[in-house]
């Protein structure tokens, strides 16, 4: 009897032995199943971000060609109203030109003297930008960049006045401390009469004979 | 590619007449003002005339006023530069470019060369 029972024990615990070997084989299985299947999901997961990502890209980049075409075609047909029309009206901005508030604006690549600068603008039925307020003056910034660049705005003729007739006096100023100078040392002969945004915005007067680049400004009519 | 392509110059009497041209490619030349320029020996470059687009406005420098004419052929893609009454001052390379341009868009010029 007692011989019988050792017998089943040994069994016993043998197949307990086994059962737990097994188990752990099992449990070790599914848990490299479990990491595998874990590394797979987040594969899956990072596939699938990137791609959300991706698309949301798409997206947008295909919005904002879609929002150029609509100004484009919008630009071309008021371009062909004005062609057809007498050209007295202008209701939108001529190709390349950048329009704000009501006016259109072009900037130039290359540099010449203010007075060239000038003729230039007037040939494009315009004038050298005159500049009436902050939010104008940033936005110029804004397409300029750092550089040098011509305005409407000169002394040549005595006091400081704008191209366009806009009173200097009482309107929007922004000249470097201690400008305008008319400073004489440069060396080129006379003053400087001819006033240009510096590489950080603020106005300074120079010799207007000098190269620099312009921007050209024109109003826009109402449209009827 | 933009290719601006002056013909006309050569040797001239002062008093003389010439009639320069100048022949585009590479762009929509109806969609530019264009001008002359000019650079005589050992100066700098200088502006002679400009004309708007539809060639209603044109500009001159003093120094040419009631002597040259600037004309334009959109039909053609063709720039012209009428020069009367020449003068020695008036020998220099003469180009055509699009207004407003950089450099790289300026022809090779012909020269003009006021000389009895």
């Known amino acids: 009897q007692n011989s019988q029972l050792r017998e089943d024990l040994l069994a016993l615990r043998q197949n307990f032995s086994n059962l737990t070997v097994s188990t752990e084989d099992q449990v070790k299985a599914l848990s490299t199943q479990g990491s595998s299947v874990g590394r797979k999901m987040k594969l899956v997961e990072s596939k699938l971000e990137k791609q959300q990502k991706d698309l949301t890209e798409d997206h947008s980049s295909l919005l904002l060609h879609v929002k150029q075409l609509v100004s484009d075609v919008r630009s071309l047909s008021c371009q062909m109203a004005a062609f057809r029309g007498n050209g007295s009206e202008r209701t939108c901005c001529p190709i390349n030109w950048v329009e704000y508030e009501g006016s259109c604006y072009w900037f130039s690549s290359s540099v010449r003297p203010w007075t060239e600068a000038d003729k230039y603008c007037q040939l494009e039925n315009a004038h050298l930008v005159v500049v009436t307020s902050r939010d104008e003056q940033n936005f110029l910034q804004r397409h300029m960049g750092p550089l040098n660049t011509w305005i409407g705005l000169t002394d040549q003729n005595g006091p400081w006045k704008w191209v366009d007739g806009t009173d200097y006096e009482t309107g929007f100023q922004n000249w470097r401390p201690e400008q305008p100078d008319n400073w004489y040392g440069h060396g080129l002969g006379g003053g400087e009469d001819c006033a240009h945004f510096t590489t950080d915005g603020r106005w300074n007067d120079d010799v207007c004979r000098r190269p620099y680049r312009w921007v050209c400004e024109t109003k826009l009519d109402k449209a009827n | 590619e933009v290719q601006l392509l002056e013909s006309g110059g050569g040797l001239v009497q002062p008093g003389g007449s010439l009639r320069l041209s100048c022949a585009a490619s590479?762009?929509?030349?109806?969609?530019?003002?264009m001008e002359w320029a000019r650079q005589a020996p050992g100066k700098g470059l200088e502006w002679v005339s400009g004309?708007?687009?539809?060639?209603?406005?044109?500009y001159y420098a003093d120094s040419v006023k009631g002597r040259f004419t600037i004309s334009r052929d959109n039909s053609k893609n063709t720039l012209y530069l009428q020069m009367n009454s020449l003068r020695a001052e008036d020998t220099a390379v003469y180009y055509c470019?699009?207004?407003?341009?950089?450099?790289?868009?300026w022809g090779q010029g012909t020269l003009v060369t006021v000389s009895s």
């Open positions: 004309i708007s687009r539809d060639g209603s406005r044109t």
């Open positions: 590479g762009f929509t030349f109806a969609d530019y003002p």
């Open positions: 470019a699009k207004m407003g341009s950089n450099f790289d868009y």
